[in-house]
C-alpha cells in the first residue's frame, strides 16, 4: 500500500481581518493510526494551533467530523482572524506511540495572509498656536493595516499639499503596519475656517479612502489690528475715544485703557462680531471729561490677545481747544460706555 501523504492543496490563503480562514488538509491513507495536529511555523518554536487528540481550541473548528473512523479530511477553520494570525500553517500527521505520539509526515504548508483595514487616520497639529505666514507641522497616523502597500495624501481646503514626509513601519515583514506622515502648512490670515485633511487609501478600503481632519482654527492665531479714534459727544466737555480691535482670532482678548500711563479700566472681549473669514472685531470706548484740564492727555488702548505680549495704540487728546458738539453718537449712548473724569 502507498505511504500516507499529507496534502495541503492551497499554497496561500488570503483572508480579511475579522473573517474566518479555512485551511485545507487531507490524508491519502488511514494508516498509520494517529492524530493530526496543526502548527503555525516550523521547527522547535512552532505554535500549536489545533490538536485532534487533546487541548482546548476555542477559535478552531474542524470542517469534518474527526471522530469518524474513515475520516481523512483534517481541514480546519479559524475564526475572528487578525493580522497576528498571519503565517505558514502546517498540517502534521502523527503516528501513535508510547508514551508520546511521533511526528510522521507534514503537509507542504499554507501561507495565511491577512488583509486588515487601516485605523481611522488621526491628525494632530502643533501644541501651540502660530500666526499667519508661519509654517506649522501636522502629523497623521494610521495603524494596523496589512498588506504594507498604502497611499497617503494631504489636502488643505481640497487643494493637495506637496510638502510632506511619510514613513511606513516596520520596514521588514510584519503582521501589520503603521503609517506616519508629517506635512508642512503655511498659515494665512484667512485660515480660521480652513481644514487640513489626511487621506489614506488601502486595498481593503475598496476605493473609499479614510480621512482624518484638523481644523486650523485650533492652530492659528490672528493678531488684532488696533485703531484709536476720537469723536465729540453731546456734552461739550466730554470726548468719546474708541478703540477698534479688528480681525483677531481666537476670541480670548483683554483690553486695558491707560491715561498718561496709568491704568484706567480693564475689560474682556465679550460681545464680539464675527467676520466672514472667522476672525472677530470688537470695540471699546472711553468717555473722557476734559473740563478743567490744563495739559494734554495721552490715551493708550492696550490689548493682550490669547496670552501674547500686549500690543497698544495711543491717541493724544488735546485739551486746549475743547471740541464742539457734532451731533449724536450712538456708541456713546451704549450702556457699556464708561465715563471717566480726569482731574
Amino acid at each position: 500500500e502507498e505511504e500516507l501523504q499529507v496534502i495541503q492543496p492551497d499554497k496561500s490563503v488570503l483572508v480579511a481581518a475579522g473573517e474566518t480562514a479555512t485551511l485545507r488538509c487531507t490524508a491519502t491513507s488511514l494508516i498509520p493510526v494517529g492524530p493530526i495536529q496543526w502548527f503555525r511555523g516550523a521547527g522547535p518554536g512552532r505554535e500549536l494551533i489545533y490538536n485532534q487528540k487533546e487541548g482546548h481550541f476555542p477559535r478552531v473548528t474542524t470542517v469534518s467530523d474527526l471522530t469518524k473512523r474513515n475520516n481523512m479530511d483534517f481541514s480546519i477553520r479559524i475564526g475572528n482572524i487578525t493580522p497576528a494570525d498571519a503565517g505558514t500553517y502546517y498540517c502534521v500527521k502523527f503516528r501513535k506511540g508510547s508514551p508520546d505520539d511521533v511526528e510522521f509526515k507534514s503537509g507542504a504548508g499554507t501561507e495565511l495572509s491577512v488583509r486588515a483595514k487601516p485605523s481611522a487616520p488621526v491628525v494632530s497639529g502643533p501644541a501651540a498656536r502660530a500666526t499667519p505666514q508661519h509654517t506649522v507641522s501636522f502629523t497623521c497616523e494610521s495603524h494596523g493595516f496589512s498588506p504594507r502597500d498604502i497611499t497617503l495624501k494631504w489636502f488643505k481646503n481640497g487643494n493637495e499639499l506637496s510638502d510632506f514626509q511619510t514613513n511606513v513601519d516596520p520596514v521588514g515583514e510584519s503582521v501589520s503596519y503603521s503609517i506616519h506622515s508629517t506635512a508642512k502648512v503655511v498659515l494665512t490670515r484667512e485660515d480660521v475656517h480652513s481644514q487640513v485633511i489626511c487621506e489614506v487609501a488601502h486595498v481593503t478600503l475598496q476605493g473609499d479612502p479614510l480621512r482624518g481632519t484638523a481644523n486650523l482654527s485650533e492652530t492659528i492665531r490672528v493678531p488684532p489690528t488696533l485703531e484709536v479714534t476720537q469723536q465729540p459727544v453731546r456734552a461739550e466737555n466730554q470726548v468719546n475715544v474708541t478703540c477698534q480691535v479688528r480681525k483677531f482670532y481666537p476670541q480670548r482678548l483683554q483690553l486695558t485703557w491707560l491715561e498718561n500711563g496709568n491704568v484706567s479700566r480693564t475689560e474682556t472681549a465679550s460681545t464680539v462680531t464675527e467676520n466672514k473669514d472667522g476672525t472677530y472685531n470688537w470695540m471699546s470706548w472711553l468717555l473722557v471729561n476734559v473740563s478743567a484740564h490744563r495739559d494734554d492727555v495721552k490715551l493708550t488702548c492696550q490689548v493682550e490677545h490669547d496670552g501674547q505680549p500686549a500690543v497698544s495704540k495711543s491717541h493724544d487728546l488735546k485739551v486746549s481747544a475743547h471740541p464742539k458738539e457734532q451731533g449724536s453718537n450712538t456708541a456713546a449712548e451704549n450702556t457699556g460706555s464708561n465715563e471717566r473724569n480726569i482731574y
Epitope: E54, G55, H56, P58, R59, G79, N80
Partner: antibody
C-alpha cells in the same frame, strides 16, 4: 481589578428552571482569549464544571448536563447567565462564576472565581 | 470523559512538614493541560499551579508540581498554617473539563 459576582434565587422548587447571573468587572468579554463559565460544588463535595462561553460566542457544555443547561452572555458583555432546567435536589450546590483564559497551544484554565452562591432545590 | 483520582483523600500533617498530593488520570494527558486549585473553608477555589509545574501569580515557591502521562504530583515543601485546605487537580485536555475529588490537607 477583576471582580465576579453571582446572583440568583437561593431557593428553587424541583422541576423548575434555575437562573443565575454573573456580573463581572475589570475586563471585557470582547477581548480575545477570554471566556466565562460556571462550576458547581454540592455541599461537602467536589467541583463540577458545567459550561463556559468564549469571547467569540463558542459554547461548551458538560455532557452530563448538556440537555438541561444554557449559557449566554448579554450584549453589553458585562453579564453571563446560566439556565438549568428541570432541577432536582441533586442540583443543590454552591454555583461559582469563573473566568477562563486561553493561553494558546490548547491551554485554558480558570483564572478568577466569584465567591459563589448557594442554590437549594427544595419544595 | 477523563476521570481524575486524587490520593490520599485526607492528609494529616504538621506545620513545617512536607506534603505530597497525587493526581492520577484515566487517560494520558500532556503536562500542559493539568492544573491545581486550592480551596479554603468558606472560600472559592483559587488557581495554584497551571500546566503541571507553573506557579500562578502570587503563589509562594514552597508549592511545586510535577508529573507526566497519567501521574501528577503537588508538593508543598514546608507547610505553613495557611496551607491547610482542600486541593483539586483539573484537566483541560478534553471537554468535558473534569476535577479530581479533592485531597483534604488537615493539621495533625
Amino acid at each position: 481589578q477583576v471582580q465576579l459576582q453571582e446572583s440568583g434565587p437561593g431557593l428553587v422548587k424541583p422541576s423548575e428552571t434555575l437562573s443565575l447571573t454573573c456580573t463581572f468587572s475589570g475586563f471585557s468579554l470582547n477581548t480575545y482569549d477570554i471566556g466565562m463559565g460556571w462550576i458547581r460544588q454540592p455541599p461537602g463535595k467536589g467541583l463540577e464544571w458545567i459550561a463556559h462561553i468564549w469571547w467569540n460566542d463558542r459554547e461548551y457544555y458538560s455532557s452530563a448536563l448538556q440537555s438541561r443547561v444554557t449559557i449566554s452572555k448579554d450584549t453589553s458583555k458585562t453579564q453571563v447567565s446560566l439556565k438549568l432546567s428541570s432541577v432536582t435536589a441533586a442540583d443543590t450546590a454552591v454555583y461559582y462564576c469563573v473566568r477562563i483564559d486561553y493561553f494558546g497551544s490548547g491551554q485554558a484554565w480558570f483564572t478568577y472565581w466569584g465567591q459563589g452562591t448557594l442554590v437549594t432545590v427544595s419544595s | 470523559e477523563i476521570v481524575l483520582t486524587q490520593s490520599p483523600g485526607t492528609l494529616s500533617l504538621s506545620p513545617g512538614e512536607r506534603a505530597t498530593l497525587s493526581c492520577s488520570s484515566s487517560s494520558t494527558i500532556s503536562s500542559t493541560y493539568l492544573h491545581w486549585y486550592q480551596q479554603k473553608p468558606g472560600q472559592a477555589p483559587r488557581l495554584l499551579i497551571y500546566g503541571t509545574s507553573n506557579l500562578a501569580s502570587g503563589i509562594p515557591d514552597r508549592f511545586s508540581g510535577s508529573g507526566s502521562g497519567t501521574d501528577f504530583t503537588l508538593t508543598i515543601s514546608r507547610l505553613e498554617p495557611e496551607d491547610f485546605a482542600v486541593y483539586y487537580c483539573q484537566q483541560g485536555s478534553r471537554i468535558p473539563f473534569t476535577f479530581g475529588q479533592g485531597t483534604k490537607l488537615e493539621i495533625k
